[in-house]
Interface confidence: low
Amino acid sequence: GQFRVIGPGHPIRALVGDEAELPCRISPGKNATGMEVGWYRSPFSRVVHLYRNGKDQDAEQAPEYRGRTELLKESIGEGKVALRIQNVRFSDEGGYTCFFRDHSYQEEAAVELKVEDPFYWINPGVLA
């Protein structure tokens, strides 16, 4: 059946070196365990993470994300997932495309990641 893919609707913020979680879900919610779920980096669509046939497809992942991503699928039975990016870098900032594919149906949504410098938030008065 048909569905829509829905992102968070606002930018996700993370500090350099921290983890970021980019949520994505299908509506109406249904079991997505058997679906293909993926994340592309927009606009050049390098593969950030790909989940197919019940397994993460590490070989298809862009080198700069290898070993740094995890698909959080505790709620995949309800059609909800999130991409966790570890050790966030400034170069991770930008647009991501999340997609769900169910046999002959595929839809996408967008998620924006904002990366911030942790040192920017130090109160200068503390350093005096």
Epitope: Y40, S42, P43, S45, G95, A109
Partner: nanobody, 117 residues
């Protein structure tokens, strides 16, 4: 605003081939692909391609159809071989991508593909 220009539909006999092309103006795509809708049926995915080169196909067309794209020229082409009457439908090009800082989806007007037996 993204304009999609489709070409290449027509009438072909069973076992024949056709080539569909779709050109997008205005923005770089995230994915571009082809969907089809036969009378009385829902619109369904035929083949879709990310600008990074990853391609997905409907099971019914695997091994017969090939999608290729050029993310510099913003075009996507569907080569359809070994066509059969079940492939008869209106074929629609779909663009998704970032347009003026928002993620958008655009559909083409559709091109008729008819396979006669």
């Amino acid at each position: 605003q993204v304009q999609l220009v489709e070409s290449g539909g027509g009438l072909v006999q069973t076992g024949g081939s056709l080539r569909l092309s779709c050109a997008a103006s205005g923005s770089m795509f995230s994915t571009m692909g082809w969907f089809r809708q036969a009378p009385g049926n829902q619109r369904e995915l035929v083949a879709i391609m990310s600008s990074g080169g990853t391609a997905n196909y409907a099971d019914s067309v695997k091994g017969r159809f090939t999608i290729s794209g050029d993310n510099v020229k913003n075009t996507v082409t569907l080569q359809m071989n070994s066509l059969n009457p079940e492939d008869t439908a209106v074929y629609y090009c779909r663009f998704t991508g970032w347009v003026k800082s928002s993620f958008s989806t655009y559909w083409g007007q559709g091109t008729q593909v008819t396979v006669s037996s």
